[in-house]
């Protein structure tokens, strides 16, 4: 029999390299049975996760899974960091693994790193 617990399917150590000034949607895959749980996003600041209250979010429903989406309209350099989604379900708090956004910023050609550096770990050069 399939479990009817709420499950959040963010993979351990998941990460996204994204470009400042571009739109981006961060998805929290949510599996639930009957009633859709209340889901929130927070951003890690040291050991605490600060709830993102004033950010645009939406639900996307698919056949076997739903997605709670955090919208970046657009991505800003200070969006760099780790995020977590949490679901309240029957008085229980279920937390996802954290997912990390590496925000890359366009630099002028004179500041360009070497090709090898950029190809291997581009985000480190633009934090």
């Amino acid at each position: 029999k399939e479990s009817c617990d709420v499950q959040l399917y963010i993979k351990r150590q998941s990460e996204h390299s994204i470009l400042a000034g571009d739109p981006f949607e961060l998805e929290c895959p949510v599996k639930y049975c009957a009633n859709r749980p209340h889901v929130t996003w927070c951003k890690l600041n040291g050991t605490t996760c600060v709830k993102l209250e004033d950010r645009q979010t939406s639900w996307k429903e698919e056949k076997n899974i739903s997605f709670f989406i955090l919208h970046f309209e657009p991505v800003l350099p200070n969006d760099n960091g780790s995020y977590r989604c949490s679901a309240n379900f029957q008085s229980n708090l279920i937390e996802s693994h954290s997912t990390t956004l590496y925000v890359t910023d366009v630099k002028s050609a004179s500041e360009r790193p070497s090709k090898d550096e950029m190809a291997s770990r581009p985000w480190l050069l633009y934090r």
Epitope: S17, G21, P74, T104, V106, S120
Partner: antibody, heavy 115, light 114 residues
Framework: EVQLVESGGGLVQPGGSLRLSCAAS????????IQWVRQAPGKGLEWVGF???????YYASRAKGRFTISRDDSKNSLYLQMNSLKTEDTAVYYC?????????WGQGTLVTVSS | DIQMTQSPSSLSASVGDRVTITCQAS??????LSWYQQKPGKAPKLLIY???TLASGVPSRFSGSGSGTDFTFTISSLQPEDIATYYC????????????????FGGGTKVEIK
Amino acid sequence: EVQLVESGGGLVQPGGSLRLSCAASGFDISKYNIQWVRQAPGKGLEWVGFINYGGSAYYASRAKGRFTISRDDSKNSLYLQMNSLKTEDTAVYYCARGLSNSDLWGQGTLVTVSS
Amino acid sequence: DIQMTQSPSSLSASVGDRVTITCQASQSISSWLSWYQQKPGKAPKLLIYRASTLASGVPSRFSGSGSGTDFTFTISSLQPEDIATYYCQSTYGGVVGSTSDDNPFGGGTKVEIK
């Protein structure tokens, strides 16, 4: 409704100038990277350049020195000023929101360079 | 300068077939690659960005993979509405703030139904 609308295309003689506009609605154009892409009749896509959210413009070498991308935040619009036009600049010109994640495109405006 | 080589330039497949298009960069572009679909008379539509991330609202039959210089775009089960031309685009030059003498778009692949 979130959209981009290009305008300003038309017929121009070789050596002439034209200014294309890209008007945004439903979002603040100044916060985004916006790229210009063109497509000659029956050909593939060709990158022209882009302006980043900080206002810095970058160009393909074929456009450098002849084309200028600018922004008017008060009009929520972007412009492509094209000078010294050549017959090979004949194309549909598109503006698109985002560089890596270009999720929104205009319908395009046709520029014909011919004598 | 980065050159993008896309192949094949055209292909014909049956409804339900798996379709694969490749794009090769002349130097490493990490994962800064997008894939677009364009139908006649219409603007391009983003399908995949960052090599493998499905754009919002795009059916899951479309997928992308690869990094460095070699990239693949796949339609797992071709549908009649997928008839279009598909393009890859390297956004690496924009990311590092350089520009290229070459076009960061591949030459396109026209997909037709058998």
